[in-house]
Interface confidence: low
C-alpha cells in the first residue's frame, strides 16, 4: 500500500481519455482502458464510468518528455507510464509515454497490462514484491484475454476499499512459493548452463555458479509458449531446447522459437496412445522420455525410437520407483523429480545416491 494510505472517498469513479496514441485506434484504446479498469472493479466495490467531457477523477493522457508534472518521460523504452495516487487535480491521473509502441498483443508494450498496473497506483496501491503480482514493478507480458487479477493484488485493493459487492468473492492466481514443502515441478531443463524449473505459468531460473534463483513468467521470455508445460530437455549437440505439452512440442534456440513449431510428438515415433510426456532428458546422443512408469529411448542421430522400448523406469534406473514429474542432467547425474522430492541418479555407478526435497534447488534449506 502507498505510504499514508491515500484512497478515494467515493467508490463510483469517473475517468476521461484526454487523447489517443497513433499506434492504436480510438476503439482499441477505449477497450484496453475499459478492460484495465474492469480488472479492479471485479475485485472491489469500485465502479468506473467513462465521461467524454468535464472533470473526471482519473484523466488518462498520452504525453511525451517534459509534460508539466515534474516527471518527464524519456523517449522509447525506459519509463513507460506513471500515475498519481488518489487526490484532487492531478491525483489519480495516468500518463502514458506517447513515444512508446503501444500494442494489443505480446509485442512491447501491451496497453491493457500497463494501464491496469498504472490504475492500481491511481487507486492507492504501490509496488508489490510478489513477482506474480500486477503491481510488481517489472513489465511482463501476460495473455490479456484470459487475464485474472492475481491474489496479491486482490488482497491489496480489498485492504483499501473492502470486498467486492459481488456475491461470489473473486480469487486470483497465487504465485508459487519456492519454499512450499509440497511444491512439485511441471518440467525442468538446462539451457546453456542454467537450470529452469517450470510451474504453471512461471519458471524459476537457477544460475549454476552463482546459485542465484529468480522467478519469471514463462510469457516474459517466450510469449508464444503455453502455460503448464509438461516436459523439457536440452539437446546439447544441436544447442536446442525442446518443450512439451500434450502432444505438441516446441524447439527453442536460446530464446527464439524455431520455425515450423509446434509439432506433433508423432515425429519422435510415439503412437497415438501417448497423449502426454511426463519428463525428458537427453544424454550421450539419446533422449529419454518418461511416461507413466515407463521410459522410452530415442536415438538423436537416427531420429527414431530404439528397439526394445519402452522399458519400466526401475529396470533402467534402479531406485527410481515412482512416476517422474521432471528430470534434467547435471555432471554424471540424472536429477529425477517426483512430487516434492528429487532423486540423484548417478549413471556411472548406476544407482540413486541422494534423495532430498525438490526445492533445495530453489535455495530452500
Amino acid at each position: 500500500l502507498t505510504p499514508g494510505s491515500p484512497k478515494w472517498t467515493h467508490t463510483n469513479l469517473t475517468y476521461r481519455i484526454i487523447n489517443h496514441t497513433p499506434q492504436l485506434s480510438r476503439a482499441e484504446v477505449k477497450t484496453a482502458i475499459e478492460k484495465a479498469f474492469h480488472v479492479w472493479s471485479v475485485a472491489s466495490p469500485l465502479t468506473f464510468t467513462e465521461i467524454l467531457q468535464g472533470e473526471a477523477d482519473i484523466n488518462i493522457a498520452f504525453v511525451s518528455r517534459d509534460h508539466g508534472d515534474n516527471s518527464p518521460f524519456d523517449g522509447p523504452n525506459g519509463i513507460l507510464a506513471h500515475a498519481f495516487q488518489p487526490g484532487q487535480g492531478i491525483g489519480g491521473d495516468a500518463h502514458f509515454d506517447s513515444e512508446e509502441t503501444w500494442t494489443q498483443d505480446s509485442k512491447n508494450y501491451n496497453l491493457f497490462l500497463v494501464a491496469a498496473h498504472e490504475f492500481g497506483h491511481s487507486l492507492g496501491l504501490s509496488h508489490s514484491t510478489d513477482p506474480g503480482a500486477l503491481m510488481y514493478p517489472n513489465y511482463a507480458y501476460r495473455e490479456p484475454s484470459t487475464y485474472s487479477l492475481p491474489q496479491d493484488d486482490i488482497n491489496g485493493i480489498q485492504t483499501i476499499y473492502g470486498p467486492s459487492d459481488n456475491p461470489i468473492q473473486p480469487t486470483g492466481p497465487s504465485t508459487p512459493k519456492a519454499c512450499d514443502p509440497h511444491l512439485r515441478f511441471d518440467a525442468t531443463t538446462t539451457l546453456r548452463g542454467e537450470i529452469y524449473f517450470f510451474k504453471d505459468k512461471y519458471f524459476w531460473r537457477r544460475h549454476p555458479q552463482l546459485r542465484t534463483v529468480d522467478l519469471n513468467f514463462i510469457s516474459l521470455f517466450w510469449p508464444f509458449l503455453p502455460n503448464g508445460l509438461q516436459a523439457a530437455y536440452e539437446d546439447f549437440d544441436r544447442d536446442l531446447v525442446f518443450l512439451f505439452k500434450g502432444r505438441q512440442y516446441w524447439a527453442l534456440s536460446g530464446y527464439d522459437l524455431q520455425q515450423g513449431y509446434p509439432r506433433d510428438i508423432s515425429n519422435y515415433g510415439f503412437p497415438r496412445s501417448v497423449q502426454a510426456i511426463d519428463a525428458a532428458v537427453s544424454y550421450n546422443g539419446k533422449t529419454y522420455f518418461f511416461i507413466n512408469n515407463q521410459c522410452w529411448r530415442y536415438d538423436n542421430q537416427r531420429r527414431s525410437m530404439d528397439p526394445g522400448y519402452p522399458k519400466s523406469i526401475p529396470s533402467m534406473f534402479p531406485g527410481v520407483n515412482c512416476r517422474v514429474d521432471a528430470v534434467f542432467l547435471q555432471d554424471s547425474f540424472f536429477l529425477f523429480f517426483s512430487g516434492p522430492q528429487y532423486f540423484a541418479f548417478n549413471f556411472v555407478s548406476h544407482r540413486v545416491t541422494r534423495v532430498a526435497r525438490s526445492n533445495l534447488w530453489l535455495n530452500c534449506s
Epitope: 524519456d74 525506459g78 519509463i79 500497463v114 517489472n138 513489465y139 546453456r192 521470455f221 536460446g254 530464446y255
Partner: nanobody, 121 residues
Framework: QVQLQESGGGLVQPGGSLRLSCTAP????????IGWFRQAPGKERERVSC????????NYADSVKGRFTISRDNAKNTVYLQMNSLKPEDTGVYYC??????????????WGQGTQVTVSS
Amino acid sequence: QVQLQESGGGLVQPGGSLRLSCTAPGFTLDYYNIGWFRQAPGKERERVSCISSSGGSTNYADSVKGRFTISRDNAKNTVYLQMNSLKPEDTGVYYCAHCMATTEGYEYDYWGQGTQVTVSS
C-alpha cells in the same frame, strides 16, 4: 553475484572517440537488457544508454544522443558503447549493468567495477 567487466576507458581529447566493452566471463548476457551508466565526481550515477536483449531496442540519455551508440554482439557475449565527439562533461567512471524496463523506468543490478573515461585537452 554476476560480475560484469568493463574495458576501453582512457584519456582522450575533446572531440575524440572511445569504444567501451562490457563482458561477463562465465555468464551468458544474451537475454539480458544491458545498459551503460556513468558517474562524474560528486554527482549521481546516471543512465547513458540501454539496449534490449535482442539488440532491437535502444535508449539514450538526451545528453549523448547522436554522439554515442550502444550495440551488442551476443555471439561474443559483449555489449559495446561507441563514444564519438567526446566532451569534457562526459568525464566519469562508466559502468555497465543489467537494466530492466519497468513501468516506472529502468532498474539496475549486476554492476561492474567501472572504467574511467577522462576527456581533457
